[in-house]
Structure formats: C-alpha cells, structure tokens
C-alpha cells in the first residue's frame, strides 16, 4: 500500500519492423500497472497486455489483421495494491498514442543476400524474401507478398579491389548484372519503398563478396 498517485503514461512510441509492431511508453511503473487498448479509426477498442508492469506491448497480432488500416492505441494506468488513483470521477487515466499505419510506416528490416551465381560475365544476385507476420489463408506472407510492386531493392556492387560503387534496382528479388571476367565483386542490397514519405529505406544488408560460400560460379 501507499499514497503515491497513479500517473499517466507518456512518450507513447510505435516501434515496428517488417510489421512486427511494439508500442513503448514511459514511465517505469511505481505502484501502478498498465493495460493497452488498440483500435482502428472506425473499429472498437481491444485490450491487450492486461495489468502489466512492462512498458511495452506487442500489438503485432492486431495490426497484421489489416496492415493498411490506421491504428490508434491508448495506455491505461491503474493503481497497484491499495494506492490512490488520480483519475477524475473514477475515470481511469490514459494516454493516446500517435496514429500508426503499418503499411506506410513499418520499418523495412535489413535485407539478406540469399545467393549469387556467376555465369560468364553475368551475376545473378538473389535477395531473401523475408517472411512477415502478416497472414493470409493461414500462411505467413513474405515482404514481397505484402508490398508487391511498391517494394524495390537497390543493389550496390563493386570490384573487390576498388572503391567505386555501382547500383542497380529491381522490382523483384533478383538482379542480373554484368561483371568483368576474372574480377571478384562485393554486393550489398537495400530495400526501398519509393512512394513513402517516411521510413523509405532499410539499412544495407551485410556485404557478401564473390569467392565466399554464398556464391556459385559457372563458366
């Protein structure tokens, strides 16, 4: 028990990558707990993370139901134990999050180069089509399934021996580029959604170089 009053949550922040979506907030609770609710603009409020002492709540299960909807969350503060509440007229304290539209705002996760194959002076570079937590007909969709042609990949490549980078883009997950015979090249890719105004680009993938295990070479 105690007399510390319940305080409202603040700094509500969406953290989302490839639709894995977590709401974070402050403060760390002292003599209080939180329950989170999430809603679409036209929908009903659904409670999650009941009576928690965490300052984050995984809302992925809710947002993947329709990633093109705009969501709003709110965090309720309740007194723990026999602590007074500051809510007026018995109303619980809560704070609203900013709006969040997963399709437009989720961060693009760091891509991975799945493989590259050299045939003569051509190299085929394949980007792993990462699985998301978005479902359709009980199967998880890939990033490409969700974004379709809105998603492009940019390939950065350079000769092992030089610093000059070249670029190439694709609306699929594969690149076919020309290389100089007998030269080793290094590759890095980046996911991009050109139509976005925020979170347009992912971080670059780890660099992969020819002569390492991911490559195949055929004359």
């Amino acid at each position: 028990s105690g007399t510390t009053n319940t305080v409202a949550a603040y700094n509500l922040t969406w953290k989302s990558t490839n639709f894995k979506t977590i709401l974070e907030w402050e403060p760390k609770p002292v003599n209080q707990v939180y329950t989170v609710q999430i809603s679409t603009k036209s929908g009903d409020w659904k409670s999650k993370c009941f009576y928690t002492t965490d300052t984050e709540c995984d809302l992925t299960d809710e947002i993947v139901k329709d990633v093109k909807q705009t969501y709003l969350a709110r965090v309720f503060s309740y007194p723990a134990g026999n602590v007074e509440s500051t809510g007026s007229a018995g109303e619980p304290l809560y704070e609203n999050s900013p709006e969040f539209t997963p399709y437009l705002e989720t961060n693009l996760g760091q891509p991975t180069i799945q493989s590259f194959e050299q045939v003569g002076t051509k190299v085929n570079v394949t980007v792993e089509d990462e699985r998301t937590l978005v479902r359709r007909n009980n199967t998880f969709l890939s990033l490409r399934d969700v974004f379709g042609k809105d998603l492009i990949y940019t390939l950065y490549y350079w000769k092992d021996s030089s610093t000059g980078r070249k670029t190439n883009t694709t609306h699929t997950n594969e690149f076919l580029i020309d290389v100089d015979k007998g030269e080793n090249y290094c590759f890095s890719v980046q996911a991009v959604i050109p139509s976005r105004t925020v979170n347009r680009k992912s971080t670059d993938s780890p660099v992969e170089c020819m002569g390492q295990e991911k490559g195949e070479f055929r004359e």
């Epitope: 329950t35 009903d44 409020w45 659904k46 409670s47 002492t53 619980p92």
Partner: antibody
Framework: QVQLVQSGAEVKKPGASVKVSCKAS????????MHWVRQAPGQGLEWMGI????????VYAQKFQGRVTMTRDTSTSTVYMELSSLRSEDTAVYYC??????????????WGQGTMVTVSS | DIQMTQSPSSLSASVGDRVTITCQAS??????LNWYQQKPGKAPKLLIY???NLETGVPSRFSGSRSGTDFTFTISSLQPEDIATYYC?????????FGGGTKVEIK
Amino acid sequence: QVQLVQSGAEVKKPGASVKVSCKASGYTFANYYMHWVRQAPGQGLEWMGIINPSGGITVYAQKFQGRVTMTRDTSTSTVYMELSSLRSEDTAVYYCARGGSKVAALAFDIWGQGTMVTVSS
Amino acid sequence: DIQMTQSPSSLSASVGDRVTITCQASQDISNSLNWYQQKPGKAPKLLIYDASNLETGVPSRFSGSRSGTDFTFTISSLQPEDIATYYCQQYNFHPLTFGGGTKVEIK
C-alpha cells in the same frame, strides 16, 4: 492435474478480518494471474481483484480498495486474500480463479472450490 | 464500470430445445467476453472465451457469437446436465464485470 484448493469456511464478527488461502498445483504457478471472485448467497459473481504471482503485483476493484490485500507465497504456490473491516454484506462464497493463458488472459479457466465466509454478530 | 445486462434472468425449456441467452454491454467491449456455467453448490466453469471460442473439453452444443455490443450464448440442444446458471463476463475494461446470470431449468 491442475487444481486450486481453498481453505475452509470461516465465521467472523463485524469489524474483523478474514484471510482465505488458495493453493495451486499441476501447473507453473508464476505463469498465470490469479483472480478473486465472490458470490453472495443467491446472487451473481463479483470480481474483487487480481494478483500476478511472478511479481506479486496486485490490482483491486475500486469497491474493495483499502479493505482487500492479496498476497502470494511462491514457495508453496499459494495465494491469499485478506478482507478487513468485515460487514454483513461481505457474507459470501469467495473463489480464487486462475487467469487463462495469453490466448485468453482474463478468462477464468480453473476455479477453487470456494470458501464460505459468514459475517455475523 | 461496464454494465453487463443479461437476459432473460431465468428460462424453462424442454430437453432438446435450442436455448439462447443474451448479454448486452453498456459500451463497446470488442470480443472480450467469456461465458461460464455454474451448477448449484459448485464453482463456475469456463465454457466460451473471446465471445466465440469453445474452451477445450466443452461440448460443441455450446456456442457464442457477437454483434456489436450484443453477445449471444446458445445451447443447440438442451440436455438434462445443462441445468445451471450461466454468466457472461467482460474483460475489456477495468474492473472486470459479470452479467447478472441466467438460470436455466428443464420444463
């Protein structure tokens, strides 16, 4: 099997306190919330509050705020509900009930057998 | 607090009849509603969670549905062992609240 076993019936005088125990077995005690629900004779069910056994954090219905205290003993997988300043309206059967898994976090999937508390002068 | 208005408060039906109980929430509670069965002198038993999901081991003659703030609990074919009081319970808002109960009897 999963079960909750509660302490026996109590008769108390107005103004006194009562402490009811609920011993859990057959599952990992710390992984499930425990709730207390009461039922006055011939009446419906009334939620009193919740305790998280892993951290001991409690949340009470405002109606019972200041009069109820829920505690737990992880060494014996037991939760306790103490109600003070008893009055005749507190005469009821008191149940502990386990909160379900994450799928149904606030559905009460396992119940104790109930403890009858009679408040009479 | 959220009020859960359950109706009817009691009903009498014949074995094999379809029995329907409704619960209306005083405000939107999403699908955060559970149904319990309580037989005389016994603790309640969870039948349906999240408005329409059947708890493991519960006979399929029991079902639940939602339309907005109205929730329906149905026994498709009443059996003698279904004599009990049935309660709805919402958990979308603190504090958790129950409906007043519906007593089901056999004609």
